[in-house]
């Protein structure tokens, strides 16, 4: 049903859903701090633009009695319960920030007449793609998929002279929320990734993964997995690995690779790490000082959600336009705004664009080095290191199928 919005007469409210079930196990206090820091910035920007208005956030907490798994498994109904609570209290703001679980976002989008914008730090799954009033501020699965297909097809780089058409995907069901949906997208038989590959098999058991590493009859040399180096080590240990195996480790929200004193462990030598290009350091920010790298990205997405709202509010107010309209609800896409850490670009469907970075381990220095970058906005790969010091033969990535010549 339609809920009246606290969103007019110079007073603009943001509804922030503080859900017990969340994409990342982040204390709600940290998210509150991020939102409040964002509000301070927005107020300053509006004031500088000569707009004398009030912007506040209302934090809506669920009671946590029923939906208390803490992860996303029981988030589907929690989101709807919170919406009901908002509806009963007639406390809907101009914008809804909050659901980070794919399940809850999908259900909330489905079961409500959304005449207001929804901003999510998460909602990684393909089922949240192409939603007209949903904006996602952390890289969704679709963006990962497009990179992988682009990289698989690339065959004209000094270090990658074969296009690939095969892959194993390791997915054992214990993944974090982001990894779960990334791998889910790769596994889906109707996804772009599956459509573009000739062969793809999902490995679900540790032993399956371990056996492939030295199996002469393997159907692909490439294995995609998601998680950090420790996750890989737990699985792979110090086992021998065939020389033409390439492991692609998807670890987008981890900037530990970009710490100066980091040395890559020996087990990372046959691994290419896909991560996001780090922004400027957030370590001096009050909300992120005590956060791990992953959680910093999550809190930052909340903060940027507030800044995005401020950006849109400023534009609409300067143009004398009404905020409680479908036009406003549909406007949070195809734009660039000033985020906390620099410009943030949203694509035509409201999903954040970013620069992904593919790292390799230099056999000379045992340090991580950038092999290439990928701009999700233009779906283009840019080689950086034309003569990488790889572990693979001739310092080139091997063919994806052993024994197959150049194509």
């Amino acid at each position: 049903s339609q809920v009246s919005q606290n969103c007019h007469n110079g007073s603009y409210e943001i509804s922030v859903l503080m859900m017990g079930n969340s994409a990342f196990a982040e204390p709600l206090k940290n998210l509150e701090d991020a939102v409040n820091e964002g509000l301070e910035i927005v107020r300053g920007r509006l004031q500088n633009a000569g707009l004398n208005v009030t912007v506040n956030a209302t934090f809506m907490y669920s009671d946590g009695l029923i939906h208390n798994s803490g992860d996303c498994r029981s988030s589907t109904c929690e989101g709807l319960d919170l919406l009901r609570k908002i509806s009963n209290a007639q406390r809907m703001g101009c914008v809804l920030i909050g659901p980070s679980c794919t399940y809850s976002t999908f259900q909330m989008y489905l079961d409500t007449e959304l005449s207001y914008p929804m901003i999510s730090a998460g909602s990684f799954g393909l089922s949240c793609d192409y939603k007209e009033t949903l904006t996602r501020l952390m890289s969704p699965a679709r963006k990962l998929m497009y990179f992988l297909v682009n990289f698989w097809k690339t065959n004209d780089l000094p270090f990658k002279t074969y296009s690939w058409s095969t892959s194993y995907v390791y997915k054992n069901g214990t993944e974090t929320e982001d990894c779960f949906w990334y791998l889910n997208a790769l596994e889906a038989s109707v996804s772009y990734f599956s459509h573009e590959l000739g062969f793809k098999v999902v490995l679900r058991q540790d032993k399956e993964f371990q056996d492939i590493l030295m199996d002469h009859n393997r159907k692909s040399n490439v294995i995609i997995m998601c998680g950090g180096p420790e996750f890989l080590y737990k699985l792979k240990g110090d086992r021998a690995v065939a020389e033409d195996i390439v492991i692609i480790l998807v670890d987008l929200f981890n900037d530990q690779y970009f710490e100066d004193n980091v040395t890559a462990p020996d087990y990372m030598k046959n691994v290419l790490v896909l991560t996001l290009s780090p922004g400027n350091s957030l370590l001096n920010s009050s909300f992120s000082r005590n956060l791990s790298p992953t959680k910093r990205d999550f809190a930052l997405a909340y903060l940027n959600g507030i800044l995005l709202f401020g950006h849109m509010l400023k534009i609409f107010l300067e143009n004398g336009e009404n905020i409680t309209t479908p036009k406003f609800a549909h406007a949070f896409r195809n734009l660039t705004f000033e985020g906390y850490d620099g410009p943030v670009t949203l694509d035509d469907w409201g999903d954040v664009d970013s620069t992904m970075v593919l790292l390799y381990t230099s056999v000379d220095t045992k340090k991580y080095k950038v092999l290439l970058t990928y701009d999700t906005h233009v779906n283009k790969t840019y080689p950086v290191d034309m003569s990488p010091t790889f572990t693979w033969k001739n310092s080139k990535l091997p063919n994806d199928i052993t024994g197959r010549g150049p194509q």
């Epitope: 970009f258 710490e259 100066d260 340090k367 991580y368 080095k369 950038v370 970058t373 840019y382 950086v384």
Partner: nanobody, 123 residues
Amino acid sequence: EVQLVESGGGLVQPGGSLRLSCAASGFTLDDYAIGWFRQAPGKEREGVICLTSGGLPKYADSVKGRFTISRDNSKNTLYLQMNSLRAEDTAVYYCAASGATSRWNCPPQYDHWGQGTMVTVSS
């Protein structure tokens, strides 16, 4: 002796492309952070792109999406690929190197500079 030599400049039409090279001698590029700078007539020198020693490119907003940087350690050479060139890109382009204190950040200042190569964008 440490030396940086730029090449590849010239006259190009708006919308066109150029690839500049910066050849290093007397040191290994791989251990250094490298920056491309430019100075337009009557203006101050400005940073265009930096490549940290770890290989992370950092771009000025004015060239993002148009310019890309790469490094070939086997040739000890750095490249600046410039696409969709505009009249305002007209300048002398310099490459500079700095013994890196951080693998992932651009240095505040550079120790070694090349002589520059002129890029003119005009129809």
